[in-house]
Interface confidence: medium
């Protein structure tokens, strides 16, 4: 069954490199026979030299957000990291309640786009702490 850590599937609400979606050491996912590198590749050389002649499109494997096309960030998804859309106004985001709580996540979201911040949705103030919904809202 799904691990409880999956309840919070986002990265910190900060752009890379601060948000943990920029291929920092330790941010690679390791499942199955993926050990410390993404899919068994050398993180430092093979992927960056072989795969990133062009900017990655949505869903493409990446190491850091600079590998992705404009409007995308590099975030954890399943067993790898892929280029995902930067969040738009009204889209669900996740704010971590304590430092380091994003470390075990399998699914991450991008950060909110320019001029937006991840804030609790107004009609969810009464909800329990664990189920409060955050969305990208204008500053």
């Amino acid at each position: 069954t799904l691990n409880s850590v999956l309840n919070s599937n986002a990265i910190k609400n900060l752009p890379p490199p601060l948000g943990g979606a920029a291929g920092h050491p330790g941010s690679a996912v390791s499942f199955g026979n993926d050990h410390s590198t993404l899919d068994g590749y050398s993180r430092r050389t093979t992927l960056s030299s072989k795969m990133y002649h062009t900017k990655g499109q949505e869903g493409s494997v990446c190491l850091r957000s600079s590998d992705c096309a404009s409007g995308l960030c590099c975030a954890r998804h399943f067993w790898s990291k892929i280029c995902k859309p930067v969040l738009k106004e009204g889209q669900v985001c996740t704010k971590h309640r304590r430092k380091g709580s994003h470390g075990l996540e399998i699914f991450q979201r991008c950060y909110c786009g320019e001029g937006l911040s991840c804030r609790i949705q107004k009609d969810h103030h009464q909800a329990s702490n664990s189920s409060r919904l955050h969305t990208c809202q204008r500053h």
């Epitope: 799904l2 691990n3 068994g40 949505e58 869903g59």
Partner: antibody
Framework: QVQLVESGGGLVQPGGSLRLSCAAS????????MSWVRQAPGKGLEWVSG????????HYADSVKGRFTISRDNSKNTLYLQMNSLRAEDTAVYYC?????????WGQGTLVTVSS | DIALTQPASVSGSPGQSITISCTGT?????????VSWYQQHPGKAPKLMIH???NRPSGVSNRFSGSKSGNTASLTISGLQAEDEADYYC???????????FGGGTKLTVLG
């Protein structure tokens, strides 16, 4: 545009084998995880298997584990599913799907019929 | 194991809004809100309509929206059109082992 074309389906006897292929075009095949999903006649979707972009990491549904093998040839932009020890309950349309933001592109499917 | 439950069928008239539910246990849809929705017309391949619970891929009409409350994810189709008649599947992920899990599917009928 993204295109996935399955082939290799057909009629096979119980206990037999079949190898499905999926030819991919319109995207950088080696940058994406890929999957096989099947659908029995008149039934819902069932995920069969997934493979990482290099092919070193594979995952299977319990119902096919030990009988099916997923693989890929990135130089040929082709995904494969080797199906052994086939059973009547494996009868289905088999779709290959790109695992981008979830299963974001699908082929049209190839029908596998297991019957004596 | 994860199980996602959908109604077998829903119907609506053109122009109306309908909602299809997908209910799971706290360890799948509720505790883990990464849910996707697929549309499948008869004899055709499925098409991704919503990912991450509420996000539409490019090219998908804004008449389609997704949400989640507690253990139930929902797909809402507004301004129902004849071409919306299809089967709809919700899908989530289990990670031990890693597998995709689909709901049983919901047949949407557009009346009239």
């Amino acid at each position: 545009q993204v295109q996935l074309v399955e082939s290799g389906g057909g009629l096979v006897q119980p206990g037999g084998s079949l190898r499905l292929s999926c030819a991919a075009s319109g995207f950088t095949f080696s940058s994406y995880w890929m999957s096989w999903v099947r659908q029995a006649p008149g039934k819902g979707l069932e995920w069969v298997s997934g493979i990482s972009y290099s092919g070193s990491n594979t995952h299977y549904a319990d119902s096919v584990k030990g009988r099916f093998t997923i693989s890929r040839d990135n130089s040929k932009n082709t995904l494969y599913l080797q199906m052994n020890s086939l059973r009547a309950e494996d009868t289905a349309v088999y779709y290959c799907a790109r695992m981008g933001i979830d299963l974001d592109y699908w082929g049209q499917g190839t029908l596998v019929t297991v019957s004596s | 194991d994860i199980a996602l439950t959908q109604p077998a069928s829903v119907s609506g008239s053109p122009g109306q809004s309908i909602t299809i539910s997908c209910t799971g246990t706290s360890s799948d849809v509720g505790g883990f809100n990464y849910v996707s929705w697929y549309q499948q017309h008869p004899g055709k391949a499925p098409k991704l309509m919503i990912h991450d619970g509420s996000n539409r891929p490019s090219g998908v009409s804004n008449r389609f929206s997704g949400s989640k409350s507690g253990n139930t994810a929902s797909l809402t189709i507004s301004g129902l059109q004849a071409e919306d008649e299809a089967d709809y599947y919700c899908q989530s992920w289990d990670v031990s082992p890693i597998t995709a899990v689909f709901g049983g599917g919901t047949k949407l009928t557009v009346l009239g």
